[in-house]
């Protein structure tokens, strides 16, 4: 279930969830469709200061790079 993740524990969780894709500490630019730009929060704010789940962690994974055809 949802839990609080801080420090190295948060990095470990992101590495596990995102794998070789890597991850961002801030949501990628252009993330979401909100017109009114609120101050940007990052994964630290979202998961260390309140409980977060797998879905929220996945939001900070880098996009998959398309594999080149041989």
């Amino acid at each position: 279930g949802p839990e609080t993740l801080c420090g190295a524990e948060l990095v470990d969780a992101l590495q596990f969830v995102c794998g070789p894709r890597g991850f961002y500490f801030n949501k990628p630019t252009g993330y979401g469709s909100s017109i009114r730009r609120a101050p940007q929060t990052g994964i630290v704010d979202e998961c260390c200061f309140r409980s977060c789940d797998l879905r929220r962690l996945e939001m900070y994974c880098a996009p998959l790079k398309p594999t080149k055809a041989a």
Epitope: T4, G7, A38, P39, V44, D45, C48, F49
Partner: antibody, heavy 119, light 112 residues
Framework: QVQLQESGPGLVKPSETLSLTCTVS????????WSWIRQPPGKGLEWIGY???????NYNPSLKSRVTISVDTSKNQFSLKLSSVTAADTAVYYC?????????????WGQGTTVTVSS | QSVLTQPPSVSGAPGQRVTISCTGS?????????VHWYQQLPGTAPKLLIY???NRPSGVPDRFSGSKSGTSASLAITGLQADDEADYYC???????????FGGGTKLTVLG
């Protein structure tokens, strides 16, 4: 057990830059979140900003244009720079640590260092 | 004006129970962000007293307890002692400010 010690000049002139250092002992700077907090004389606590060793930083919006928090992993230190100071920046400045075992609570604090802004 | 509102002062006699409230909004406490409480004895640095709404760090007596409901939180101190006289601060995260926020602080006076 992590311990923190603030250091820096106790007197800064108006319009100059306040520079403080927090030395970390008993733990690696690469493992935790590090914060600066201040307390003007006779007033409450004000969060200045924090950073994670990865480079993720977050600053108080009211101070953001004047604040920089940086880290020197080789010395196990992190620092605060506050530019264009005025008398309103006179305060006790604390560094603090979120070790991650306390759900984001700042569980280790330095003893604080008093900074006076005056000409 | 603090984002989190605390009463400026509370008082109680030794042995009594006192509570300190911390009122926030839907962008901080009400958004699910944890509330932490700090005790600041005169002339010293703050000390974490309650973390994650209702958890005590090791060494903190069970006379201190925290709770959270909706957009508010509270700290309760039972069996009040003279050395509980201090300033108490609540802290949380605010998504609209994208930063940590403290309450204005509450001065606890132990009477007698």
């Amino acid at each position: 057990q992590v311990q923190l010690q603030e250091s820096g000049p106790g007197l800064v002139k108006p319009s100059e830059t306040l520079s403080l250092t927090c030395t970390v002992s008993g733990g690696s700077i690469s493992s935790y979140y590090w914060s600066w907090i201040r307390q003007p004389p006779g007033k409450g606590l004000e969060w200045i900003g924090y950073f994670f060793y990865s480079g993720y930083t977050n600053y108080n919006p009211s101070l953001k244009s004047r604040v920089t928090i940086s880290v020197d992993t080789s010395k196990n230190q992190f620092s605060l720079k506050l530019s264009s100071v005025t008398a309103a920046d006179t305060a006790v400045y604390y560094c603090a640590c979120i070790t991650g075992t306390t759900k984001g609570g700042m569980d280790v604090w330095g003893q604080g260092t008093t900074v006076t802004v005056s000409s | 004006q603090s984002v989190l509102t605390q009463p400026p002062s509370v008082s109680g006699a030794p042995g009594q129970r006192v509570t300190i409230s911390c009122t926030g909004s839907s962008s901080n406490i009400g958004a699910g962000y944890d509330v932490h409480w700090y005790q600041q004895l005169p002339g010293t640095a703050p000390k974490l007293l309650i973390y994650g709404n209702n958890n005590r760090p090791s060494g903190v007596p069970d006379r201190f307890s925290g709770s959270k409901s909706g957009t508010s939180a509270s700290l309760a101190i039972t069996g009040l002692q003279a050395d509980d006289e201090a300033d108490y601060y609540c802290q949380s995260f605010d998504s609209s400010l994208s930063g940590s926020v403290f309450g204005g602080g509450t001065k606890l006076t132990v009477l007698g």
